[in-house]
C-alpha cells in the first residue's frame, strides 16, 4: 500500500516588533520534531500594522487595541485554530520605547500595559510585552542572519543553499538600522573587547562565540534627522533653514516643540526666537554629508579605537549583512547590488540629492511624500554612518551585503528573539539521528 502523509506536525510562533516608526507582526513555523535543528524555522507571514510606533500612542492609549486588530486577526487566519492556544506571542519594543521610558517610566509602562491587555484578548499563548535592550536587539539580529545563512550548522555542504554563502563557518556581522537606533554586531578577529558592556559570549550548537555589539540610541535614521535639524537651526540666522539634505525646491514647516520633544535633541536645545521654521531644500550631497558628520564626535576615544562618541569598536572583520532600513533605503535608491562600489554609491547619491523636488515627485508618484522627501538624507546618512561612523572603506564596502530576506525570512532581531525564548538554539550540537520515523506510516 502507498504511504499516506499524516497531518503536518508543526508549531508556530508570533513576534511583534514594536519599532519607533511602526509595528510589524511576524509569524514563524517549524516542524515540531526538528526544534533543535538549525535552519528549520521559517517566516510564513509578515503583517505591517497601519499607523505609527506604539510610543506615539501616549496621548491615545485607548486606540492601541484597534491599532493591533488587523494584524492579530491575520495571525488568527494564518495559524490553524487547533494551534492557537499553544502558539506563543511575544512583543519586543525597541528604541522608540527606550526613548519614551527615558522621558517617563510611567508613560512607557502605561503604553505597555495597554498593549499587554490588548494582546491578552486573543486566543494565543501571550508571553508578554517588554522593552528589549539595545544589546539584545544587536545580538538577536546577529543570531537571526547567521541562523538563516546556516552558519551554525556543523555540516559542510558542497553546494550553496542560501545567497551570500561562502561555504565556511565564518559568521556574518549584523548591521541594523531603525528609526531611533542602529546596531553593529560581529565576531572580531582575536581582538579583546575592551569595553565589557559591548561583549557577549554565546555557546551555540557546541561552538563558543565572543561577539561585539553596540546599539547607538538616537542614531536611527529618524532621530539622526531630528538631531541634524536641531544642530543646524542653532546657527540659522532666521526661521529659514536652507538644508542640503533635501531636494532643491522642497519646503516643509517644522514646529520647534516637535524638534525638542525627543531626548535625542537635548544637547542642541536652545531658546529660539520663533516657534516654527521652514526647511528649504538645496540638495547638495557633499554639504549634507558634512552636516551629518557633525553628529559623530570622533575627537574623544578612551579605547584603542572607537566608532564615535567614545564608543569602543574593534577592527571590522568578515562579511556583514546590512538589514532593516539599511536595506529599505538602499533598495529604494537601487543601490543594493553587490556590483555597486562605494564610489558609485556616492556618485548616485550626489545625482539623486541634486534632483529637483518636483521632478522627484513626478518620478516616484506612488511614494508618500513624507518618505520620499527623506531618501536623500537617509541615503547620505547611511554612507556617513558606515564610512565615518563604523570605518568601512571603499575596499571593505564589498563586504557589506544589503539584505532584505534570507530564505524567505526577514533579516532582523525578531527570529533570533523567538529562537531564544522558545529555547530552540541549543548550546550543544544535537546528536544527529537518522531520518525521522514520524512523518509517514
Amino acid at each position: 500500500t502507498q504511504n499516506k502523509a499524516l497531518p503536518e506536525n508543526v508549531k508556530y510562533g508570533i513576534v511583534l516588533d514594536a519599532g519607533s516608526s511602526h509595528t510589524s507582526l511576524y509569524i514563524y513555523k517549524w516542524p515540531a520534531e526538528k526544534e533543535n535543528d538549525t535552519g528549520v524555522v521559517h517566516q510564513v507571514e509578515e503583517c505591517r500594522v497601519k499607523g505609527p510606533g506604539i510610543s506615539k500612542f501616549v496621548q491615545k492609549v485607548n486606540e492601541i487595541g484597534i491599532y493591533l486588530t488587523d494584524c492579530m486577526e491575520r495571525a488568527r487566519e494564518v495559524i490553524p485554530r487547533s494551534q492557537h492556544q499553544e502558539t506563543p506571542v511575544y512583543l519586543g519594543a525597541t528604541a522608540g520605547m527606550r526613548l519614551l521610558r527615558m522621558e517617563s517610566e510611567e508613560l512607557a509602562d502605561r503604553v505597555l500595559d495597554v498593549v499587554e491587555r490588548s494582546l491578552s484578548n486573543y486566543p494565543f499563548d501571550f508571553q508578554g510585552a517588554r522593552i528589549i535592550t539595545g544589546q539584545e536587539e544587536g545580538a538577536y539580529g546577529w543570531i537571526t542572519i547567521n541562523y538563516l545563512l546556516g552558519k551554525f550548522s556543523q555540516k559542510t555542504r558542497w553546494f550553496s543553499i542560501v545567497p551570500y554563502e561562502t561555504n565556511n563557518q565564518e559568521t556574518f556581522g549584523a548591521l541594523d538600522l531603525g528609526g531611533a537606533s542602529t546596531q553593529v554586531t560581529f565576531v572580531p578577529q582575536n581582538q579583546t573587547i575592551e569595553s565589557p558592556d559591548n561583549a557577549l559570549q554565546f555557546r551555540l550548537y557546541g561552538k563558543d562565540y565572543n561577539v561585539y555589539t553596540h546599539s547607538f540610541l538616537c542614531y536611527g535614521k529618524d532621530q539622526a534627522l531630528w538631531q541634524k535639524l536641531a544642530k543646524d537651526i542653532q546657527v540659522a540666522s532666521n526661521e529659514i533653514l536652507r538644508d542640503p539634505c533635501f531636494h532643491p525646491g522642497y519646503k516643509k514647516v517644522v514646529n520647534v516643540s516637535d524638534l525638542y520633544k525627543t531626548p535625542c535633541t537635548k544637547r542642541f536645545e536652545m531658546t529660539l526666537p520663533f516657534q516654527q521654521f521652514e526647511i528649504q531644500g538645496i540638495g547638495n550631497y557633499q554639504q549634507c554629508h558634512q552636516s551629518i558628520l557633525e553628529l559623530f564626535n570622533t575627537s574623544y576615544c578612551p579605547y584603542s579605537q572607537c566608532a564615535f562618541n567614545g564608543i569602543f569598536l574593534p577592527p571590522l572583520q568578515g562579511d556583514f549583512g546590512a538589514f532593516s532600513a539599511f536595506y529599505f533605503v538602499m533598495k529604494f535608491l537601487n543601490l543594493t547590488s553587490e556590483k555597486v562600489s562605494q564610489e558609485k554609491v556616492t556618485e548616485m547619491m550626489k545625482k539623486f540629492c541634486a534632483q529637483p523636488w518636483e521632478e522627484i515627485k513626478t518620478s516616484y508618484a506612488g511614494v508618500k511624500e513624507k518618505y520620499l522627501s527623506e531618501y536623500c538624507f537617509s541615503g547620505t546618512y547611511i554612507l556617513s554612518l558606515l564610512l565615518q561612523g563604523y570605518h568601512f572603506t571603499a575596499d571593505s564596502w564589498e563586504h557589506i551585503h544589503f539584505i532584505g530576506k534570507i530564505q524567505g525570512s526577514d533579516a532582523g532581531w525578531t527570529l533570533g528573539y523567538m529562537l531564544n525564548l522558545t529555547n530552540m538554539i541549543p548550546a550543544e550540537q544535537p546528536l544527529s539521528t537518522p531520518l525521522s520515523h514520524s512523518t509517514y506510516v
Epitope: 501616549v58 522621558e103 517610566e105 502605561r110 558592556d197 540610541l217 531626548p263 537635548k266 544637547r267
Partner: antibody, heavy 115, light 111 residues
Framework: QVQLVQSGAEVKKPGASVKVSCKAS????????MHWVRQAPGQRLEWMGY????????TFNQKFKGRVTITVDTSASTAYMELSSLRSEDTAVYYC?????????WGQGTLVTVS | DIVMTQSPDSLAVSLGERATINCRAS??????????MYWFQQKPGQPPKLLIY???NQGSGVPDRFSGSGSGTDFTLTISSLQAEDVAVYYC?????????FGGGTKVEIK
C-alpha cells in the same frame, strides 16, 4: 542589580567649588537620565537638575542655574555634579537618582560641608 | 513651581494601627492619564526609598501594607498596619513639571 555609588564626604570653604561623582552599574547607563537632589539638615529634599547621559543635554532647577554643572563620562558610567560659589546654606547631603520621572534608585548620598 | 504641601507634619500611631498621610499639589500633577506623584520613605542616614509611583503603584519590594491613592491635586499614602520598621520620614514628590518638587515631609512615630 542597579547600583549608584557616590564619592566621599567633602569639606569646602565658602566661594569654593565641589564636584561629586556617581558611578552607575547594573544597567545600560545611557538608557536613563541621572538626577541630582540635595537635602540640607532638617530640610525637605530639593531637586537640582538632571542630565541625559546619552548626549550630555541637561535641565536645571532655575534656583541653581549658573552655579551647577552636571556632566557624564559614559565610558566610566559615571555622572558628576559640580556646584560652584559655595555658601554655608549649601551644606547638605547630595544624592544622585536614576530615572525619567520615577526616582527608583538612589546613591547613598555625599555630605558636603561648607564652613 | 508646583508646591507640594504635606499634612500632618508628624504622626504618632500605635503598632498595628492605620497611618494616613496627605499631600496636596498647588496644581494638577496628572498628564496623559497618569498621576506623576510619588511617595518616598527616608530613615536617618539613608537615601529616600521609593514606595509608591504613579500615585497608586507599589515600588519593587515594598510591603503590601503601603498603598497610595488620589489624582489631580489630592493624594494619600496609607500604612494599613504600622510596624516598628515603618518609623521614618515620608515625602511626596511630583515630576509632572520642572522643577520637580517634594513635600516638606511627615514624621511617623510609634504611639
Amino acid at each position: 542589580q542597579v547600583q549608584l555609588v557616590q564619592s566621599g564626604a567633602e569639606v569646602k570653604k565658602p566661594g569654593a567649588s565641589v564636584k561629586v561623582s556617581c558611578k552607575a552599574s547594573g544597567y545600560t547607563f545611557t538608557d536613563y537620565n541621572m538626577h541630582w537632589v540635595r537635602q540640607a539638615p532638617g530640610q525637605r529634599l530639593e531637586w537640582m537638575g538632571y542630565i541625559v547621559p546619552l548626549n550630555g543635554g541637561s535641565t536645571f532647577n532655575q534656583k541653581f542655574k549658573g552655579r551647577v554643572t552636571i556632566t557624564v563620562d559614559t565610558s566610566a558610567s559615571t555622572a558628576y555634579m559640580e556646584l560652584s560659589s559655595l555658601r554655608s546654606e549649601d551644606t547638605a547631603v547630595y544624592y544622585c537618582a536614576r530615572g525619567g520621572t520615577r526616582f527608583a534608585y538612589w546613591g547613598q548620598g555625599t555630605l558636603v560641608t561648607v564652613s | 513651581d508646583i508646591v507640594m504641601t504635606q499634612s500632618p507634619d508628624s504622626l504618632a500611631v500605635s503598632l498595628g494601627e492605620r497611618a494616613t498621610i496627605n499631600c496636596r499639589a498647588s496644581e494638577s500633577v496628572d498628564n496623559f492619564g497618569v498621576s506623576f506623584m510619588y511617595w518616598f520613605q527616608q530613615k536617618p542616614g539613608q537615601p529616600p526609598k521609593l514606595l509608591i509611583y504613579g500615585a497608586s503603584n507599589q515600588g519593587s519590594g515594598v510591603p503590601d501594607r503601603f498603598s497610595g491613592s488620589g489624582s489631580g491635586t489630592d493624594f494619600t499614602l496609607t500604612i494599613s498596619s504600622l510596624q516598628a520598621e515603618d518609623v521614618a520620614v515620608y515625602y511626596c514628590q511630583q515630576t509632572k513639571e520642572v522643577p520637580y518638587t517634594f513635600g516638606g515631609g511627615t514624621k511617623v512615630e510609634i504611639k
